[in-house]
């Protein structure tokens, strides 16, 4: 079934309560326009945003019988001439008579007649109509023949994009059959279709078809009022393409439309080949879109690649929400033209600052006022991270101008970064030299503390992304941030007692749920000593408050639980509800405090992993005193497992080797290297090891290479020569394979040859070593440092 037939079937269903073969039509209030009712229009009770009244009429082909409900009788079948009378197209019938067409359409043959309604003839320009009436034998006959096809074609045969030769000089009739059930012939709508005749079919249309001999190009070249558009089309090498075969829709801006553009904007675009071509192509669709087919808002892809929304308000057509079409449906042999009184400017032709919308005017105004707009050169590439208007508080706006300028500089990047270019862990540099971190979540992208809202756009010299808040680059580490806030003094002291201070100082990506002093209310000094006394317990509790990765509260999908694994090993449950972050269902007091190595969410209760039992009565008593939101399990005698902290040590440890090298046990995450002078070169890549993707970090100084795997880091060491160097090289050749992986609570396990080769990327030949052999030399003091 065709779209037309489907909509007709829907109308029939809506009308069946009124009797057999009754169709429901919707008439737009204040007009004579009627449409068979589609499902959407029926429920909306409106077409083109205008209210409709429901009319019940006989479905095409049926008629009423006196005293009976509905339309139980079938319309009589007659020849095409007689059928014109049956469907009420009496003016067309009369013209067919006087032009001597009558004999033809009463006789043998098979015809399709697109018959203008009586109203269509009344709406025809009076001069044109008079001209036809003054020359019935030629002009009128030709005009009527141009409404006819030499075979019967029902709406199901009228396929979208078809061009059917008419009976006048084979001039093309452009058929469009739209998904909303509208069928048009040269943009005239079929208002009553499929009236079968003995020698064909009659479709009533809503306007008289005028003869088409010209292309879009021809029309543009002849129309003085389109001279600006014509010139722009020539400049963009597009005019000739509008003379080729196709089914185009052109929204052609008049000269007046060009006059509305600020002259500077026009001069800039016309001086830029890429922008001017984009501008022109943005006015062209590769599909034929008649105005009569627009019964609601729909999005169409333009030749430029971006989309425009075409809608309607009563009889007016709107583009991107603005009423601007002042002449519709100029049909040509390769498409249709609608004249518009505004120039459509695609994002791709706009300067980055012009991409901002109504919700970012505070940002753009400030950028202009503080002299930053002039630094956005047309031939440069930038990214604006534009906060919405309400992100700017009165306090911010009343700041010293120099400070405000620095804040704004944090929102302009030196390069063009599109939405699809952003990835988690990315570092972006601002024009002020600050570095911003990107965090990508399931349903959000955030930069530092601020998350994006919809509306990213790409322009000629940059991109714009819209943010909920002002972006505040972090200045301090997690540890420094806690230290400067008195609320965290108890937590900080426990952290230091647990030897975890380094963890919050060094570079990394962490989420810390920091309990305030309120979380420890009522804890006595004896109880504090008890807690500190069991280092494993203390570490387990503290590390349950720490999660690898930066998780910003605003980045969470609202209302759903996010399950994260903490550094301690147990799960923690996060949920964003009404702008508040719930941590294990406890309300966070403050969230998204950004630091250089992570983010802090403030909680006023101590958190505890529900799956970890306590085996000490006193500790249980203390924890029950502090933690009320869960029932802590008690298993007598159970102890907290030791957490291997080596996993979280800095990536690179510098060892000063004094004299001959000795053997030592390498724990997880440690590396042995010679002292390095100068900055190492760092390269990161991913390698598949045993089917698992492993991020490999290479740091190179001369020939030195450190390979970091997920669990253990191995180092190949070589030096530039000298006695120590030779000794080292000999040592390496002989003893490189004497490496053990220490597994907490288990036996040492040695890698096989192939494994070591893989890990060392085939660099070092390794001997096979008997399993469980541990090699260890006397311990020496070593100076430990961290790579910068």
């Amino acid at each position: 079934n065709s779209y037309y037939d489907k909509v007709l079937a829907h109308s029939r269903i809506r009308g069946r309560d009124q009797g057999p073969n009754v169709c429901a039509l919707q008439q737009i209030l204040g007009t004579k326009k009627k449409y068979f009712s589609s499902c959407k229009n029926w429920y909306q009770g409106a077409i083109c945003g205008k209210k409709t009244t429901v009319l019940y009429e006989c479905c095409p082909g049926y008629m009423r019988m006196e005293g009976m409900k509905g339309c139980p009788a079938v319309m009589p079948i007659d020849h095409v001439y007689g059928t014109l009378g049956i469907v009420g197209a009496t003016t067309t019938q009369h013209y067919s008579d006087v032009s001597k067409l009558r004999e033809e359409i009463e006789g043998k043959g098979s015809y399709t007649y697109f018959a203008p309604s009586n109203e269509a003839w009344e709406n025809l320009d009076s001069d044109i109509r008079r001209g036809l009436e003054n020359n019935v034998n030629v002009e009128l006959l030709n005009a009527l023949h141009s409404h006819m096809v030499n075979k019967r074609m029902l709406t199901k045969d009228l396929k979208h994009g078809m061009v059917i030769p008419s009976m006048y000089n084979n001039l093309g009739l452009f058929i469009n059959h739209y998904p909303n059930g509208v069928v048009t012939v040269n943009c005239a709508r079929v208002i009553h279709g499929n009236q079968i005749a003995t020698n064909g079919v009659v479709h009533v249309i809503d306007r008289v078809l005028t003869q088409i001999g010209t292309s879009i190009q021809d029309f543009l070249e002849a129309e003085d009022d389109l001279s600006s558009f014509r010139a722009a089309a020539i400049t963009s090498d597009l005019l000739e393409s509008l003379g080729r075969d196709g089914h185009f829709t052109l929204f052609a801006p008049t000269n007046e439309a060009f006059e509305k553009l600020p002259r500077g904007v026009l001069e800039r675009i016309m001086g830029d080949k890429v922008a001017s071509e984009a501008l022109m192509k943005y006015h062209i669709l590769n599909t034929l879109q008649c105005s009569e087919a627009i019964t609601g808002g729909a999005v169409f892809e333009t030749m430029e690649g971006n989309t425009i929304e075409i809608g309607c308000e009563g009889d007016s057509i709107s583009i991107n929400g603005i009423k601007m079409v002042n002449k519709k449906d100029i049909v040509t042999k390769n498409g249709v033209i609608h004249l518009i009184d505004e120039v459509l400017i695609p994002d791709s032709a706009k300067q980055v600052i012009e991409l901002a919308g109504k919700q970012q005017t505070t940002f753009t105004d400030l950028v202009a006022q503080l002299g930053l707009a002039s630094s956005l050169k047309p031939d440069g590439e930038y990214t604006l991270l534009a906060p919405v208007n309400n992100a700017f508080s009165d306090d911010t706006l009343s700041m010293d101008q120099r400070l405000l300028k620095l804040i704004l500089q944090n929102h302009i990047l030196k390069v063009k970064v599109g939405l699809s270019d952003l990835y988690n862990g990315q570092i972006l540099e601002t024009i002020g030299g600050k570095q911003l971190r990107v965090f990508v979540y399931r349903t959000a992208i955030c930069i530092e503390n601020s998350c994006m809202v919809r509306g990213s756009k790409q322009g000629r010299n940059g991109a714009i992304h819209i943010f909920r808040e002002i972006i505040q680059p972090a200045e301090k580490s997690l540890h420094d941030k806690l230290r400067q806030d008195k609320r965290f003094s108890i937590f900080l002291s426990l952290l230091e007692a647990a030897d975890l201070k380094d963890l919050l100082t060094q570079p990394g990506d962490w989420t810390l749920f920091a309990p305030t002093n309120d979380a420890f209310k009522g804890m006595t000094s004896e109880e504090r000593e008890l807690l500190i006394g069991d280092k494993n317990a203390l570490q387990n509790i503290i590390l349950y408050h720490l999660t690898p990765g930066v998780y910003i509260g605003k980045g969470f999908e609202p209302g759903v639980t996010n399950i994260l694994k903490t550094t301690q090993g147990s799960k923690i449950y996060l949920k964003g509800v009404n702008e508040t972050l719930l941590v294990n269902e406890l309300k966070s007091k403050e969230s998204d405090i950004m630091t250089t190595n992570g983010v802090i969410h403030v909680v006023d209760k101590l958190l505890y992993p529900a799956d970890i039992p306590v085996g000490n009565d006193q500790l249980l008593e203390l924890l029950n005193k502090l933690i009320k939101y869960i029932q802590i399990k008690f298993v007598r005698g159970s102890t907290f497992k030791e957490i291997p902290m080596t996993v979280y040590r800095p990536a690179m440890t510098k060892i000063q080797i004094e004299g001959d090298p000795d053997f030592r046990l390498i724990k997880e995450g440690e590396t042995v290297t010679e002292v390095i002078h100068g900055e190492p070169v760092i390269k990161k890549y991913t390698k598949i090891i045993d089917g698992v993707p492993v991020e490999i970090t290479e740091k190179q100084t001369r020939e030195e290479r450190i390979i970091t795997g997920p669990e253990i880091k191995y180092t190949r060491i070589s030096t530039g020569g000298g006695e120590t160097g030779e000794t080292l090289q000999k040592f390496l050749q002989k003893e490189v394979s004497k490496v053990t992986k220490f597994i907490e609570g288990g036996d040492g396990h040695l890698f096989e040859d192939e494994e070591i080769k893989r890990l060392l990327q085939g660099d070092t030949p390794a001997k096979k070593i008997p399993a469980n052999k541990r090699v260890q030399g006397p311990r020496r003091r070593s100076r430990e440092g961290r790579s910068q």
């Epitope: 558009f229 400049t235 000269n255 006059e259 002259r263 001069e267 830029d272 050169k377």
Partner: antibody, heavy 118, light 110 residues
Framework: QVQLVQSGAEVKKPGASVKVSCKAS????????ISWVRQAPGQGLEWMGW????????NYAQKLQGRVTMTTDTSTSTAYMELRSLRSDDTAVYYC???????????WGQGTLVTVSS | QSVLTQSSSASGTPGQTVTVSCSGS????????VNWYQQLPGTAPKLLIY???QRPSGVPDRFSGSKSGTSASLAISGLQSADEADYYC???????????FGSGTKVTVL
């Protein structure tokens, strides 16, 4: 063919006003704008401003703002430029030019010499 | 004082190629298109090139325009005696919100 015919030469005293006309033919007057450009003797060209023959909207050069007025009469397809408070440095040949915006100043009038002298 | 800078004169023998340069700033040529006008002695100017490199119908292809950064140039190849004229470059100036012309270059055919 497109033609722009300007009024004849004028001699004015300092402080006076001058009104130069520019009659268009050979095209649809209201479909285009008109720009006015002047050239002092032996000097370069200076843009004075623009008027839309369709809407009457104007855009004047900052330097002349307040002293210049551009108008059109669509019934006669004529554009006018009036310059007030004339000074000796306003002595120049004044040109009107058809301005399609996309193709600026594609046809020019023959020019009107305005001499400001006491 | 013109905003756009042009060399005051250029010359060449018939058949040669002469190039006229025009230098501006980021607010005029740097941001916007350049147009060129030819003014034969004692006549009104005539549009020669618009939008950096477009020739209106009727202008011979011996005339070509180009733009790079904040400068533009007009090349006249196959120089003819009829090309002896003043040549002006012009562009919109964003900072002045005004259409600005160059000082003009007198091209002489030797």
């Amino acid at each position: 063919q497109v033609q722009l015919v300007q009024s004849g030469a004028e001699v004015k005293k300092p402080g006076a006003s001058v009104k130069v006309s520019c009659k268009a033919s050979g095209y649809t007057f209201t479909s285009y704008g008109i720009s006015w450009v002047r050239q002092a003797p032996g000097q370069g060209l200076e843009w004075m401003g623009w008027i839309s023959a369709y809407t009457g909207n104007t855009n004047y050069a900052q330097k002349l703002q307040g002293r210049v007025t551009m108008t059109t009469d669509t019934s006669t397809s004529t554009a006018y430029m009036e310059l007030r408070s004339l000074r000796s440095d306003d002595t120049a040949v004044y040109y009107c030019a058809r301005d399609v915006l996309v193709v600026p100043f594609d046809y020019w009038g023959q020019g009107t010499l305005v001499t400001v002298s006491s | 004082q013109s905003v756009l800078t042009q060399s005051s004169s250029a010359s060449g023998t018939p058949g040669q190629t002469v190039t006229v340069s025009c230098s501006g700033s980021s607010s005029d040529i740097g941001s916007n298109r350049v147009n060129w006008y030819q003014q034969l002695p004692g006549t009104a100017p005539k549009l020669l090139i618009y939008s950096n490199d477009q020739r209106p119908s009727g202008v011979p292809d011996r005339f070509s325009g180009s733009k790079s950064g904040t400068s533009a140039s007009l090349a006249i190849s196959g120089l003819q005696s009829a090309d002896e004229a003043d040549y002006y470059c012009a562009a919109w100036d964003d900072s002045l919100s005004t259409y600005v012309f160059g000082s003009g270059t007198k091209v002489t055919v030797l």
